[in-house]
Amino acid sequence: EVEKTACPSGKKAREIDESLIFYKKWELEACVDAALLATQMDRVNAIPFTYEQLDVLKHKLDELYPQGYPESVIQHLGYLFLKMSPEDIRKWNVTSLETLKALLEVNKGHEMSPQVATLIDRFVKGRGQLDKDTLDTLTAFYPGYLCSLSPEELSSVPPSSIWAVRPQDLDTCDPRQLDVLYPKARLAFQNMNGSEYFVKIQSFLGGAPTEDLKALSQQNVSMDLATFMKLRTDAVLPLTVAEVQKLLGPHVEGLKAEERHRPVRDWILRQRQDDLDTLGLGLQGGIPNGYLVLDLSMQEALS
C-alpha cells in the first residue's frame, strides 16, 4: 500500500505519457488521476514502467473499479495484465474476442499462467461454447490448450470448430479426450474424399473405434507407426492380421520394432501365429497352431 501524500507542485499528470516513468511510486499515486488513467489505458503499454510502478497504476484502477474493470479498460491493459491475479480476473466480464486477443498478445512467449487460464475460462463460459474463432485464437497462442480441457468441457466444442485444430494441438491429449474429439472430427470431415479425409482425421484416431479402423483399412491409407501406436488398445485388438497389414501398408515392417509395446504387444497375443508368420517380420507370441480361441466377451454378451 502506498501512503497518501500530496502531489508536488507542477507534477500533476495532465496525460498518460513517457514522463511518468520518472515518477516515484508515491508520486504516481499522488499525481495520476485514476479516471485519466482509465481513459488513456491504451498509452500504458508504450511506456517502460517497472513492475513496481505498474503495481501503483493497478492500485489506482482497483480503487476506481472495485467491482471489476469495464471491458473498455480491460482491452487496453497491456502489460498491466501481467499484474492481475485470478481473483481480479474473476470479476471481469470479457465478451469481445478482440479483448481476449489483446491480452493473450501481452502474455505471448510466456507459459499459460493461472491468470490466462482464468481469463480463458471466463471468456468461454460467457460465450456458452468454444466456437471456431475462439478455438482458432486459443490454439494459435497455446497449441496445447485443447488438451488442457476435461472431456466434459470438450463436449461443448461444436464439430465446426474442429477445422481450427492442428495436429500439434493434440500432442498432449489423452485417450479420454480423444474419445470426445474423434466423433466430432468424423462429423466435421465426413464430406471429404478418402486421402484428404485421412490426412485430417489422422490426429484424432486415438479415439477411433474398431469398426472405423476396419473401414480405413479398406482405403489404402498407409497409416504410420506413430499414429498406430496411439490407437486405443481395445480398438486394435479385434483387427485381423490382414486388416492391420492393409491399414499400415508399407509401414507394416515397423511392427517388429514395437512388438513389446502396447498396443502391438497385446494385439500379437490375440493373433494366430500362422497369420503373424504371413507378415514375414518374425513376430512372436501369437496363439500356437491347433489352439481354440474362445471369445468370452462375446459369450457374456449373448448370455
Partner: antibody, heavy 121, light 108 residues
Framework: QVQLVESGGGLVQPGGSLRLSCAAS????????ISWVRQAPGKGLEWVSS????????FYADSVKGRFTISRDNSKNTLYLQMNSLRAEDTAVYYC??????????????WGQGTLVTVSS | DIELTQPPSVSVAPGQTARISCSGD??????ATWYQQKPGQAPVLVIY???DRPSGIPERFSGSNSGNTATLTISGTQAEDEADYYC???????????FGGGTKLTVL
C-alpha cells in the same frame, strides 16, 4: 538465486560474426526486459540493445543498428545477441542486464559477469 | 542523445563524505541511476530513481537530483567503497539509456 550468465565471446576478425548468449535463472525470465551493455577495455559503460519480456519490442543504440540483432528464447530462459559486420571498436566486455519491468531499459537491477569480445586481425 | 559528464576521479579520507557529480542537460527532470563497479567485476546497482536504494545496499549511499546535476553521496566512506561509479539516465524521446564516463573513487 537470481543470476545472468553470458557466454559466446572470443576473438573474431573485422567483418566477422559472433553470437552471444545469456542464460537466466532464479526469476521468471519471460516477464522481464533484458539489455546488452558493453564496456570497452579501460572505458565506460555503453548501452547496446534491449528486448521486451515477450520479445515483441526491440531497441538498439545507433552505433550497432543494422549490424546487431537481439532475440530471446523464453522456453530456454536465454537471451541472444547476433553480432555481424564486427569492427575493432566493438571490442568490449558484453554484459546482459535486467530491467525490472516488462519492457524498457531505464536502469538495470541485475547484471551478468560479462563475456569478452575481441575484434582484431 | 543526452550527454552525462562525471569527474574522472574523486578522493576521500575514510569516514569522510564523498560526493560524485553527474551533469547533464536538465537531468533533474529525468531520473538518475548509479552503479558501483569494482575491478574485474560487473556493475552493481546502488541508487535508482534518484535516491532509492536496492535491498542490500548500505544506508551510507544516497542520491539527489535537480536542475542539471545528479549527485551520489557516500557518507562515512569505507575502504570497501573504493571503486568506479557510473551515473546513468534514460532518454525517453530517443528510447536510449545513457551512461556517464565514470568516476574512480579512491579512499585514501
Amino acid at each position: 538465486q537470481v543470476q545472468l550468465v553470458e557466454s559466446g565471446g572470443g576473438l573474431v576478425q573485422p567483418g566477422g560474426s559472433l553470437r552471444l548468449s545469456c542464460a537466466a535463472s532464479g526469476f521468471t525470465f519471460s516477464r522481464y526486459a533484458i539489455s546488452w551493455v558493453r564496456q570497452a577495455p579501460g572505458k565506460g559503460l555503453e548501452w547496446v540493445s534491449s528486448i521486451s519480456g515477450g520479445g515483441s519490442k526491440t531497441f538498439y543504440a545507433d552505433s550497432v543498428k543494422g549490424r546487431f540483432t537481439i532475440s530471446r528464447d523464453n522456453s530456454k530462459n536465454t537471451l541472444y545477441l547476433q553480432m555481424n559486420s564486427l569492427r575493432a571498436e566493438d571490442t568490449a566486455v558484453y554484459y546482459c542486464a535486467r530491467y525490472p519491468g516488462p519492457t524498457g531499459h531505464v536502469f538495470f537491477d541485475i547484471w551478468g559477469q560479462g563475456t569478452l569480445v575481441t575484434v582484431s586481425s | 542523445d543526452i550527454e552525462l559528464t562525471q569527474p574522472p576521479s574523486v578522493s576521500v579520507a575514510p569516514g569522510q563524505t564523498a560526493r560524485i557529480s553527474c551533469s547533464g542537460d536538465n537531468i533533474g527532470s529525468k531520473v538518475a541511476t548509479w552503479y558501483q563497479q569494482k575491478p574485474g567485476q560487473a556493475p552493481v546497482l546502488v541508487i535508482y530513481y534518484d535516491n532509492d536504494r536496492p535491498s542490500g545496499i548500505p544506508e551510507r549511499f544516497s542520491g539527489s537530483n535537480s536542475g542539471n546535476t545528479a549527485t551520489l553521496t557516500i557518507s562515512g566512506t569505507q575502504a570497501e567503497d573504493e571503486a568506479d561509479y557510473y551515473c546513468q539516465s534514460y532518454d525517453g524521446q530517443m528510447s536510449t539509456s545513457v551512461f556517464g564516463g565514470g568516476t574512480k573513487l579512491t579512499v585514501l
